[in-house]
């Protein structure tokens, strides 16, 4: 999570701004918070949401009249509870389409406070390891987001391919060959933001069993 805080002093109202990157696993719930300002001091709380390929939409709450307005219908984005209780934004089940920027603007008599979130969605790749030719193994991290990194123990003569998909996920395929005959077991290590996974396989004289993990 990256944070970046700036304060701008205008002649009218100062703006305090915080920028944050959040990574959320697909299918989970996301809670985005505004500045910690007592609601009694707030005049207007507005969430501005910019998702890729869609016009920006807003969810606003006027404190004095306790009125709620939204133009973000059909996106599964709501207040976490009632905004007079807590101005947090909730995404009940994050999808790849929820990637984008979420800005909470809080207007107070003392000035404006802005919290920006860059929401990145993570997808766990499906990992498989198998031997496909004599002393050659293939490790794949299928449809992850972002792309996984594949490494081998021991190191071999390797070639790696990446493929990008229409939903924003990436498949990484690493094919390795071991000429040295004293190498009998090899391990594929897949590093990913959602967690790391290691699989091992015995190099058989003929193509052997297939290992897989999710």
């Amino acid at each position: 999570t990256d944070k970046n805080q700036t304060t701008q002093n205008n002649s009218s109202s100062p703006l305090t701004q915080v920028n944050t990157t959040v990574s959320v696993q697909i299918g989970t719930k996301a809670l985005l918070c505004c500045f910690s300002i007592p609601l009694t001091k707030a005049v207007l709380i507005t969430w501005i949401i910019k998702l890729r390929g869609l016009p920006s939409c807003t969810i606003a709450y006027k404190v004095d009249t306790k009125t709620n307005e939204t133009s973000c219908l059909g996106r599964n984005i709501t207040w976490a509870s009632t905004p007079d209780h807590s101005p947090e934004l909730q995404i009940s089940a994050v999808t790849l389409q929820h990637e984008g920027t979420y800005t909470c603007e809080t207007v107070t008599p003392e000035g404006n406070f802005e919290k920006n979130y860059d929401l990145q969605v993570l997808v766990t790749p499906e990992v498989t390891l198998f031997q496909n030719r004599n002393r050659t193994a293939v490790c794949k991290a299928v449809a992850g987001k972002p792309a996984a990194h594949i490494s081998w123990i021991p190191e071999g003569d390797c070639a790696t391919k990446q493929e990008y998909w229409s939903n924003g996920t990436v498949t990484v395929k690493s094919t390795c060959h071991w000429e040295v005959h004293n190498v009998s077991t090899v391990t594929c290590h897949v590093s990913h933001l959602t967690g790391n996974k290691s699989l091992y396989i015995e190099l058989l004289p003929v193509p052997g069993a297939k290992k897989s993990a999710k």
């Epitope: 389409q97 496909n132 391919k161 990446q162 493929e163 924003g168």
Partner: antibody
Framework: QVQLQQPGAELVKPGAPVKLSCKAS????????MNWVKQRPGRGLEWIGR????????HYNQKFKDKATLTVDKSSSTAYIQLSSLTSEDSAVYYC????????????WGQGTLVTVSA | ENVLTQSPAIMSASPGEKVTMTCSAS?????MLWYQQKSSTSPKLWIY???KLASGVPGRFSGSGSGNSYSLTISSMEAEDVGTYYC???????????FGGGTKLEIK
Amino acid sequence: QVQLQQPGAELVKPGAPVKLSCKASGYTFTSYWMNWVKQRPGRGLEWIGRIDPSDSETHYNQKFKDKATLTVDKSSSTAYIQLSSLTSEDSAVYYCARSGGWLPGFAYWGQGTLVTVSA
Amino acid sequence: ENVLTQSPAIMSASPGEKVTMTCSASSSLSYMLWYQQKSSTSPKLWIYDTSKLASGVPGRFSGSGSGNSYSLTISSMEAEDVGTYYCFQGSGNPLMYTFGGGTKLEIK
């Protein structure tokens, strides 16, 4: 520049098999997947399957798994599709197309081979 | 399998007219590709990443959309734009490439 060369046409008798070729040049053959796409006259495009030339790993559209077999010859940078037991339904243009890398699709296509199944 | 439905199937436009065709996906996508195919030739990559024009594609073409709904627009129809346009998606898990049924564009 990248080129995928295919023969223009093949005439095949019903029930017979046919093997079509696609010769690649202008890039490292083993670095990209080779796909095959079918187009019947006046119809749309259908993905048949693909092969990784580096290790011959294949993926097939379920619709074509009993009809098509994909192979490669790395030494000549050529991909092949064998179609079995041909019927009139198999009369079509068959394209090879390269995929892989940053684009979730096919940046380069062959000119296509027209297969006509006729007695 | 993600089904791509294109509409209209056939359309005609006069020179200079604005043209819009759509592609609806049964499952949500992040990016859409479009191919142009002229009579008796192989398809050409036309638009990628939803809105980026492939090399050599005239600036009158544009692409837009998100989620399940995408469109290709020609700001001012020209004779050379005649052909069939296919939307396309690639899925990594399960692995499948899918084309829309195509929109055949004719000139009046």
